[in-house]
């Protein structure tokens, strides 16, 4: 789903207050609800009628350093006989998410938010067949 | 997919540098790749064999303020005849994502990362039938 544009108002102080110095803000250390965990069904990527594989990208200057991307294994969907049926389509489900980018020069470290597009998994859909012009 | 624990090392300065004052860091204003957009298919939530609905939660002190959660419409999956087949299961696909929480007291504004569990959509899976002991 979409993350709306910041419009940079969210990160600004109220108008009656002095502006943020140097175009940066104070980010408190620690993450709220850090222990919260995905409780997804086991192996759904293999058991799905629109199965997918995972690829892990790693970047030590990003938090989280590990970002996992899904790729649909098939163009069609897997039917009850375990065969691919191309009259149905496996399609990716995408999500916009935020990560934190670390920038450092010597002992000066700053952080910036970055928007990343993640394919989370796949679902099986009835294709839309538009009428031929 | 899972966001690993920070271990608070990501946000620390190198050991040879003076520690971060007051347990906070500098977060630059602006978002990298802010214009990047999900290019997900129209109406896949209705065209899926495991269809879902969306619920929007709104919080003005969170960025993004709008977080969209999916809920599977059915326990089973929709077959070629448009009927629910309960021999298959519609299951949620979840993703851990980061949001930014704004905290203010008067003109003092700070921000903190927060982990949020988002259900992005649903997929149709073959159920795991455990044998009775």
């Amino acid at each position: 789903r979409k993350i709306p544009k910041v419009g940079h108002t969210f990160f600004q102080k109220p108008e009656s207050c002095p502006p943020v110095p140097g175009g940066s803000m104070k980010l408190d250390i620690g993450i709220i609800n850090e222990n919260q965990r995905v409780s997804m069904s086991r192996n759904i990527e293999s058991r799905s009628t629109s199965p997918w594989n995972y690829t892990v990208t790693w970047d030590p200057n990003r938090y989280p350093s590990e970002v996992v991307q899904a790729q649909c294994r098939n163009l069609g969907c897997i039917n009850a006989q375990g065969k691919e049926d191309i009259s149905m389509n496996s399609v990716p489900i995408q999500q916009e998410t935020l990560v934190v980018r670390r920038k450092h020069q010597g002992c000066s470290v700053s952080f910036q938010l970055e928007k990343v597009l993640v394919t989370v998994g796949c679902t099986c859909v009835t294709p839309v067949i538009h009428h031929v012009q | 997919r899972k966001i690993p624990k920070v271990g608070h090392t990501f946000f620390q300065k190198p050991e040879s540098c003076p520690p971060v004052p007051g347990g906070s860091m500098k977060l630059d204003i602006g978002i990298i790749n802010e214009n990047q957009r999900v290019s997900m298919s129209r109406n896949i939530e209705s065209r899926s064999t495991s269809p879902w609905n969306y619920t929007v939660t709104w919080d003005p002190n969170r960025y993004p303020s709008e977080v969209v959660q999916a809920q599977c419409r059915n326990l089973g999956c929709i077959n070629a005849q448009g009927k629910e087949d309960i021999s298959m299961n519609s299951v949620p696909i979840q993703q851990e994502t980061l949001v930014v929480r704004r905290k203010h007291q008067g003109c003092s504004v700070s921000f903190q990362l927060e982990k949020v569990l988002v259900t992005v959509g649903c997929t149709c899976v073959t159920p795991v039938i455990h044998h009775v002991q």
Epitope: L75, N89, V125, P127 | R42
Partner: nanobody
């Protein structure tokens, strides 16, 4: 704007071969999916073959597996359908199509080319 134009259809005897081609203009060739469909008289349009734009995956309808081959010529932005061992039941109007988003939303279509297989 994406434009698709098929060529290569015609009349052929059972057991013969034809090669259909479809140049794809615009950005559809580098994103989404490409496909060949067919529609026989009085029947619904059906998938014949479909490929991911990257060429990484290609899938075929059971009725054509082992006889038809989907290929793409990246240099010419063209998709091709090599049809061997043709049968009378392969008689149909063949369409190339593109799904711009890998979404199962087949938006772009050629005008179709007739393939007739006589026994």
């Amino acid at each position: 704007e994406v434009q698709l134009v098929e060529s290569g259809g015609g009349l052929v005897q059972a057991g013969g071969s034809l090669r259909l081609s479809c140049p794809v203009s615009g950005r559809a060739f580098s994103r989404g999916r490409l496909g060949w469909f067919r529609q026989a008289p009085g029947k619904e349009r059906e998938f014949v073959a479909v490929a991911h734009w990257s060429g990484a995956i290609t899938s075929y309808a059971d009725s054509v597996k082992g006889r038809f081959t989907f290929s793409r010529d990246n240099a010419k932005n063209t998709m091709n359908l090599q049809m061997n061992s043709l049968k009378p039941e392969d008689t149909a109007v063949y369409y190339c199509a593109a799904d711009s988003e890998t979404s199962g939303n087949w938006v772009y279509w050629g005008q179709g080319t007739q393939v007739t297989v006589s026994s």
